[in-house]
Amino acid sequence: TLNSVLNSNAIKNLPPPLGGAAGHPGSAVSAAPGILYPGGNKYQTIDNYQPYPCAEDEECGTDEYCASPTRGGDAGVQICLACRKRRKRCMRHAMCCPGNYCKNGICVSSDQNHFRGEIEETITESFGNDHSTLDGYSRRTTLSSKMYHTKGQEGSVCLRSSDCASGLCCARHFWSKICKPVLKEGQVCTKHRRKGSHGLEIFQRCYCGEGLSCRIQKDHHQASNSSRLHTCQRH
């Protein structure tokens, strides 16, 4: 089952003390089967794995990618999975750990010298031929921080949002990905109703900025489903 697959993974996403934030001083960690941490005036334990559901790689950590944990497993469930190290199999750049990228189905080091010449080739190859673009997996094509010494400005080629300067995200533009501005209040946004539909966007928008969510514009409630306009609105 999905649960047994998940529970076989490494310890991840440790909870903080109740009501606190992660990394709270005094949090204690024990080995499996559980995590030990303070709750009230006594220590409590928690299962050692907390599945983190996702729809896109950007929702996961930089050392993770978003995918279904088992082939033919629970349909529609995608969670954040640990990135794959060098020489491990991959289907897209996102699956490889930072400092690596996916070439011919294997995670290889993103050596600055040879990587730049291949970047367009691998992005186009992924978009055009790789079945993973349409199978419900999201694609986080990602440049290692080694690629650029400075964060990408608007319009710079990127592979992950962390390659872009603050206030920008990495989004698809034609067959490559560039840094685009994070959406502000009132700007039109994309709400992905159908899972995997973001894989079909040629001009991808960034997500809504801090404190905003993508919702139907008030005066568009009466419109037909297909013409409903979504904008970034305050929570």
């Epitope: 996403n13 996702c54 729809a55 206030g167």
Partner: nanobody, 125 residues
Framework: EVQLVESGGGLVQAGGSLRLSCVVS????????MGWFRQAPGKLREIVAA????????YYADSVKGRFTISRDDAKKTVYLQMNGLKSEDTAVYYC??????????????????WGQGTQVTVSS
């Protein structure tokens, strides 16, 4: 200060239903994944259900599949857990947890970094 407040717990007969709510207040961050956990006396705290930022990916523990439904309302910064067909083994303290991130922030590993104080659910047979 960030606060997560759960409500909706209580005593219910086996086979009955309850709807838990958790409201996130304070803090200026985007809420990513949201989840419900539970802890029965003498047992480990375990995940019950979790929902992704967009709501398109939902995880359920095997023990609650087909009986519990998680949903979220971003406008209200609230996550819900609809619990139907309750069994005595569902008796536990239920906690909600969320992943709150400042704009552009991305941790190495995604996780739930804000937790509520819990609400008691007791199912009598």
């Amino acid at each position: 200060e960030v606060q997560l407040v759960e409500s909706g717990g209580g005593l219910v007969q086996a086979g009955g239903s309850l709807r838990l709510s958790c409201v996130v207040s304070g803090g200026t961050f985007s809420v990513y994944a949201m989840g419900w956990f539970r802890q029965a006396p003498g047992k480990l705290r375990e995940i019950v259900a979790a929902i992704s930022r967009t709501g398109s990916s939902i995880y359920y523990a095997d023990s609650v599949k087909g009986r519990f439904t998680i949903s979220r309302d971003d406008a209200k910064k609230t996550v819900y857990l609809q619990m139907n067909g309750l069994k005595s083994e569902d008796t536990a303290v239920y906690y909600c947890a969320v992943d709150g991130r400042a704009n552009g922030e991305r941790p190495a590993v995604a996780g739930y970094n804000y937790w509520g104080q819990g609400t008691q659910v007791t199912v009598s047979s």
